[in-house]
């Protein structure tokens, strides 16, 4: 049934990136107002982003309490005044969002190369450990503490004066690669969980190459 | 005429439960959100929670989340405020409201119910 | 949250003269699309439920006297009471309904100088 003159929300998309997550829907608002609710599926309806004007809903509070569970959202369109003087008192319209699970399916956001240091051919370079939404005791967790081996980085890595690129792979933070001494490279990394079947690689972090400021990857 | 009756406050130890109601006449209740405000002793109004004409959706101030569960009957015309876990900063008149022109636009207030929580 | 900003806290005003009472929210609760303020003024007498004078900043809910008015926009507002009649003194309040947990000033005494 559903109260005249609203209209269902419809396109409703999950907007995550480590674990910050937004429902996004159409359309935009007019004469009417939504309210979303979020549920694991063996748990109750809780209502987020009450009477709302706005077409996204962070839900990031809710889904880092358990990121592994699977979560459904719906949103409920209710029109824009009290039902007496707008339409009936029927089941308000509604549509649901497409499950979701944030450890499975949540973006992983660009990383960042921390520091690279060598010693004779070695290089050691390290990646930041960003920092989540999610929380354990109070303390905001990192990426590797919520993922651990499931969460691996690949380095790609070539000399400045070279566009043959090489590639190394880690399950930790730090990369120990050979290298030709005299010679200064360039490093790129990218997150990645080889055991997903979406979203298992993160764009590539910002270019870093020794002996210069941040430089760009050139084919 | 609107009228908005509420009932079930009381004085109460910390930690134990009290269940308000409010009794609404003269409109048609199952079309109106309504909410829960609270006005402690000389102090200003707070807002505690909303329900929505159907029901379904509820929110609530974070002061009341998880202790407080507002829900209504439509077939009786009554909105009820079940509070646990009671604590001294709970002592307050509450007062039930009805969703006026806009959600949130109170056109109408019960005269309210003393909810006092003391050992 | 929203947080609303009443001044003065009190007021003492000579009958027949003009109270004015501001109140500012921390973020604006103008909704561009209709261009409507979502705030709302209420009166609250001793021992009674506060009473809505005016919502959507400006607009005088049915049966309020047109000494009382509201002006605005976005995180500034003014309730003025034109002329103080005896039966005005009370505690004036403003609220936010843009967005939620809905918040109210702390409240503004008027009083009969």
């Known amino acids: 049934s559903g109260t005249t003159n609203t209209v269902a929300a419809y396109n409703l998309t999950w907007k995550s990136t480590n674990f910050k997550t937004i429902l996004e829907w159409e359309p935009k608002p007019v004469n009417q107002v939504y309210t979303v609710q979020i549920s694991t599926k063996s748990g109750d309806w809780k209502s987020k982003c009450f009477y709302t004007t706005d077409t996204e809903c962070d839900l990031t509070d809710e889904i880092v309490k358990d990121v592994k569970q699977t979560y459904l959202a719906r949103v409920f369109s209710y029109p824009a005044g009290n039902v007496e003087s707008t339409g009936s008192a029927g089941e308000p319209l509604y549509e649901n969002s497409p499950e979701f699970t944030p450890y499975l399916e949540t973006n992983l956001g660009q990383p960042t190369i921390q520091s690279f240091e060598q010693v004779g051919t070695k290089v050691n370079v390290t990646v930041e450990d960003e920092r989540t939404l999610v929380r354990k005791n109070g303390t905001f967790l990192t990426l590797r503490q919520v993922f651990g081996n499931d969460l691996g980085y690949i380095l790609t890595y070539r000399k400045s004066s070279s566009s043959g690129k090489k590639t190394a792979k880690t399950n930790t933070n730090e990369f120990l690669i050979d290298v030709d001494k005299g010679e200064n490279y360039c490093f790129s990394v990218q997150a990645v969980i080889p055991s997903r079947t979406v979203n298992r690689k993160s764009t590539d972090s910002p270019v870093e190459c020794m002996g210069q400021e941040k430089g760009e990857f050139r084919e | 005429q609107v009228q908005l009756v509420e009932s079930g406050g009381g004085v109460v130890q910390p930690g134990r439960s009290l269940r308000l109601s409010c009794a609404a006449s003269?409109?048609?209740?199952?079309?109106?959100?309504m909410h829960w405000v609270r006005q402690a002793p000389g102090k200003g109004l707070e807002w505690v929670a909303v329900?929505?004409?159907?029901?379904?959706?509820?929110y609530y101030a974070d002061s009341v989340e998880g202790r407080f569960t507002i829900s209504r009957d439509n077939s009786k015309n009554t909105l009820y405020l079940q509070m646990n876990s009671l604590r001294a900063e709970d002592t307050a008149v509450y007062y039930c409201?009805?969703?006026?022109?806009?959600?949130?636009?109170?056109?109408?207030w019960g005269q309210g119910t003393l909810v006092t929580v003391s050992s | 949250d929203i947080v609303m900003t009443q001044s003065p806290d009190s007021l003492a005003v000579s009958l027949g003269e003009r109270a004015t009472i501001n109140c500012k929210s921390s973020?604006?609760?103008?909704?561009?699309?209709?261009?409507?303020?979502?705030l709302a003024w209420y009166q609250q007498k001793p021992g009674q439920p506060p009473k809505l004078l005016i919502y959507?900043?400006?607009t005088r809910e049915s049966g309020v006297p047109d000494r009382f008015s509201g002006s605005g926009s976005g995180t500034d507002f003014t309730l003025t009471i034109s002329s103080l009649q005896a039966e005005d003194v009370a505690v004036y309040y403003c609220?936010?309904?843009?967005?939620?947990?809905?918040?109210f000033g702390g409240g503004t005494k008027v009083e009969i100088k």
């Open positions: 003269g409109f048609t209740f199952r079309s109106y959100g």
């Open positions: 973020q604006s609760v103008l909704f561009s699309s209709n261009n409507k303020n979502y």
């Open positions: 959507w900043a400006s």
């Open positions: 409201a009805r969703d006026g022109v806009y959600y949130g636009v109170y056109d109408y």
């Open positions: 329900i929505t004409y159907d029901g379904i959706n509820k």
């Open positions: 609220q936010q309904f843009h967005s939620y947990p809905l918040t």
